[in-house]
Interface confidence: low
C-alpha cells in the first residue's frame, strides 16, 4: 500500500509503498504465543501524528494506524548526503482480540528499534527482499519496499539506493524473478553435540548437523523450497527422559522450535526416531507460522545400549512440505553408559560405500 505525508501546502515530503508482516510474541492464559499478521489493506496514515518535520528542529515521521489501536511509525533523520529511518516503533493493543486472541494482559505496548533503512538524499530506498526489524517481542518485515523522505517534487526519484539483501553477492548471479525453483543450496550445517539427562543420568547423546527443508507458498503465490541450517551457536537445547519417550527440544533463531522424539520398541529392545515437530516463522510465506509434525517415523534405529551412526546425509521426510536433512549423525537414546556412545551400528548407506 502507498502511504504519503504532505506538508501544509500539499507537497509530499514522505512517500512509502510497502507491504508489512508482523510477528508478535505475547502472553496468553496458556503460555506465550506467536501471532503473525499482515499490515491490512485498510491501514491509514495518521495525518495529525505524521509530520514533514520542521527545519532543524524536528524530523519527518510517518505514522500508520490499523486495527484497534495498532500504529507503525517510521521516524526519519538525515545528514548532508544520506537519510534513514532512524527509528521504527510499533504500538500494539493486546485487547484487540482479533489480532491477539486470549492475551492475558490487555495493555497497550510500545516497542522500537533502529533500522538499516537508509538511502542517498534525492534517491528512493528500494528493497524487494524482506527487510526485518527486530524489536522486543516483535519482528516487522517490510516486503517490496519503496520509501523516500525529504522529497523535492512530490514523487519518487528515478534513482534508487538498493538494500544490501537485493544486491548480488560477488559469487552469485543477479537476483532472478520469483519462481518455484529451490533457493540456493547453503553449505552443510555445522555438526554439534547434544545430550539430554534425567534423574537416572544421560538418556540421549547425539552428534549431528541439521538442515530444514521447507516447501511453502509465498505471498506472491509462487512456491519456494528453502534449506535452513540450524546454527548450533544460536541454538539452545533441552529435553526430557522418560521410560518410553526421550525428547530433544532445540530452540533456534527466528522463534524456531524443533522437537525430536525417540521411542523404544520394548520387545525388540531397539530405539528409533519416532517423531519430529517443527514450529517456525517464515516472514515471506502466505501463512508465516509454519508448523509440521509426524509422530510415526521409524528412522535412526539401533539396539538399546548401542549407537546409530551415519556419515552419509540422511533425509527424514516429516510431511509433504517438510523434511530434515541430518548430516554425520551419531545418536544413542535411552541407555547411555558412562555418558559415552556404545557399540556402533552403521547405516546401510555407509556400509554400501565401504
Amino acid at each position: 500500500a502507498m502511504f504519503i505525508v504532505k506538508n501544509g501546502n500539499g507537497t509530499a515530503c514522505i512517500m512509502a509503498n510497502f507491504s508489512a508482516a508482523f510477528s508478535v510474541n505475547y502472553d496468553t492464559k496458556s503460555g506465550p504465543k506467536n501471532m503473525t499478521f499482515d499490515l491490512p489493506s485498510d491501514a491509514k496514515v495518521v495525518l495529525n501524528s505524521s509530520s514533514c518535520g520542521k527545519e532543524n528542529t524536528s524530523d519527518p515521521s510517518l505514522v500508520i494506524a490499523f486495527g484497534r489501536g495498532q500504529t507503525l511509525t517510521l521516524n526519519f533523520t538525515r545528514n548532508a548526503t544520506r537519510y534513514s529511518v532512524q527509528l521504527m516503533s510499533f504500538v500494539y493493543n493486546l485487547s484487540d482480540t482479533h489480532l491477539f486472541p486470549n492475551a492475558s494482559s490487555k495493555e497497550i505496548k510500545t516497542v522500537e528499534s533502529i533500522t538499516d533503512i537508509r538511502a542517498d538524499i534525492d534517491k528512493k530506498y528500494r528493497c524487494v527482499s524482506g527487510t526485518q526489524v527486530h524489536m522486543n517481542n516483535v519482528t516487522v518485515t517490510l516486503h517490496d519496499a519503496t520509501i523516500q523522505a525529504y522529497l523535492s517534487n512530490s514523487s519518487f526519484s528515478r534513482e534508487e539506493t538498493r538494500c544490501e539483501q537485493d544486491r548480488p553477492s560477488p559469487t552469485t548471479a543477479p537476483p532472478a524473478p520469483p519462481s518455484p525453483s529451490p533457493s540456493p543450496v547453503p553449505e552443510s550445517p555445522s555438526v554439534d553435540k547434544y545430550n539430554v539427562s534425567g534423574t537416572n543420568g544421560t538418556c540421549l547423546l547425539a552428534s549431528m548437523g541439521l538442515q530444514l527443508n521447507l516447501t511453502y507458498e509465498r505471498k506472491d503465490n509462487t512456491t519456494v523450497t528453502r534449506l535452513l541450517n540450524i546454527n548450533p551457536n544460536k541454538t539452545l537445547a533441552s529435553g526430557s527422559c522418560g521410560a518410553h519417550l526421550v525428547t530433544l527440544e532445540l530452540h533456534s533463531e527466528g522463534s524456531t522450535v524443533l522437537l525430536f522424539q525417540f521411542g523404544m520398541n520394548a520387545s525388540s529392545s531397539r530405539f528409533f526416531l519416532q517423531g519430529i515437530q517443527l514450529n517456525t516463522t517464515l516472514p515471506d510465506a502466505r501463512d508465516p507460522a509454519f508448523k509440521a509434525a509426524n509422530s510415526s517415523l521409524r528412522a535412526l534405529q539401533a539396539t538399546v545400549g548401542n549407537s546409530y551412526k551415519c556419515n552419509a546425509e540422511e533425509h527424514v521426510r516429516v510431511t509433504k512440505a517438510f523434511s530434515v536433512n541430518i548430516f554425520k549423525v551419531w545418536v544413542q537414546a535411552f541407555k547411555v553408559e558412562g555418558g559415552q556412545f556404545g557399540s556402533v551400528e552403521e547405516c546401510l548407506l555407509d556400509e554400501n560405500n565401504m
Partner: antibody, heavy 118, light 106 residues
Framework: QVQLVQSGAELVKPGASVKMSCKAS????????IHWVRQAPGQGLEWIGA????????PYAQKFQGRATLTADTSSSTTYMELSSLTSEDTAVYYC???????????WGQGTLVTVSS | DIQMTQSPSSLSASVGGKVTITCKAS??????MAWYQQKPGKGPKLLIH???TLQPGVPSRFSGSGSGRDYSLTISSLEPEDIATYYC????????FGGGTKLEIK
C-alpha cells in the same frame, strides 16, 4: 534438561513478608511463563500468579492481588515471589512451575516450605 | 476468577474397576483443561492437557473428555498405583485448580 531449583525452607512471623526464588535452567528463560502454586498441609493446589520473563507481565489470582509480587531477573534466569502480610493460613509448600509450550504446568520445582508461626 | 467444582471429593473403587472424576467450570473454558495426579509427599504430575491429550508416558487407561463447562477424567481399569489425589485445572482465563479428588482402593 529443564530444571527449576527453588530456595530453602523459611520460618517467618505473622505480619512479615517472605521472598523466595526459583532458578531455571535447560531452556530459554524468556520464552516461557513461570507460575507459582501453593499447597497448604493436607489441602489442595492453589494458583497464585504467573510471570512472563520476556516482558515482565504478571497476572495474579484475585485472592493474591496486591499481596503477592512476582519478578524475574533475566540475567540469572531466576524468578522471585514475595508474599506480604503473612498469616498462619499462608503456611504451605510453594511451587514454581514452567508451562511447556501450550501444555499446562509440565515442569515443577521441588517446592519451598514456608511456615508462618510466632 | 473462574471457579472449578470438582466431584467427588473422595471415592473408593476396586482394582480393575472404572473410575470417573468430574469438574465443572463456572463458565465456558474452551477445552483448556488439564488433569494432575499427586501422590503423598510428591509434587503433582501432569496426566492430560487440552481436555484429552495424554502426556507421553501416561498409561492409556487414563482418558479425558468434555467441552464447554463440563469435563471428566476416566480411569478405565484401576491399578493399585493409581491411588492418589487428582486435580483438574482450567487455564483458559488465568488459572484455577479444582478442589481435588482423593482416590482409594476398596
Amino acid at each position: 534438561q529443564v530444571q527449576l531449583v527453588q530456595s530453602g525452607a523459611e520460618l517467618v512471623k505473622p505480619g512479615a513478608s517472605v521472598k523466595m526464588s526459583c532458578k531455571a535452567s535447560g531452556y530459554i528463560f524468556t520464552n516461557y511463563n513461570i507460575h507459582w502454586v501453593r499447597q497448604a498441609p493436607g489441602q489442595g493446589l492453589e494458583w497464585i500468579g504467573a510471570i512472563y520473563p520476556g516482558n515482565g507481565d504478571a497476572p495474579y489470582a484475585q485472592k493474591f492481588q496486591g499481596r503477592a509480587t512476582l519478578t524475574a531477573d533475566t540475567s540469572s534466569s531466576t524468578t522471585y515471589m514475595e508474599l506480604s502480610s503473612l498469616t498462619s493460613e499462608d503456611t504451605a509448600v510453594y511451587y514454581c512451575v514452567r508451562a511447556n509450550w501450550d501444555v499446562a504446568f509440565a515442569y515443577w520445582g521441588q517446592g519451598t516450605l514456608v511456615t508462618v508461626s510466632s | 476468577d473462574i471457579q472449578m467444582t470438582q466431584s467427588p471429593s473422595s471415592l473408593s473403587a476396586s482394582v480393575g474397576g472404572k473410575v470417573t472424576i468430574t469438574c465443572k467450570a463456572s463458565q465456558d473454558i474452551d477445552r483448556y483443561m488439564a488433569w494432575y495426579q499427586q501422590k503423598p509427599g510428591k509434587g503433582p504430575k501432569l496426566l492430560i492437557h487440552d481436555t484429552s491429550t495424554l502426556q507421553p508416558g501416561v498409561p492409556s487407561r487414563f482418558s479425558g473428555s468434555g467441552s464447554g463447562r463440563d469435563y471428566s477424567l476416566t480411569i478405565s481399569s484401576l491399578e493399585p498405583e493409581d491411588i492418589a489425589t487428582y486435580y483438574c485445572l482450567q487455564y483458559d482465563n488465568l488459572w484455577t485448580f479444582g478442589g481435588g479428588t482423593k482416590l482409594e482402593i476398596k
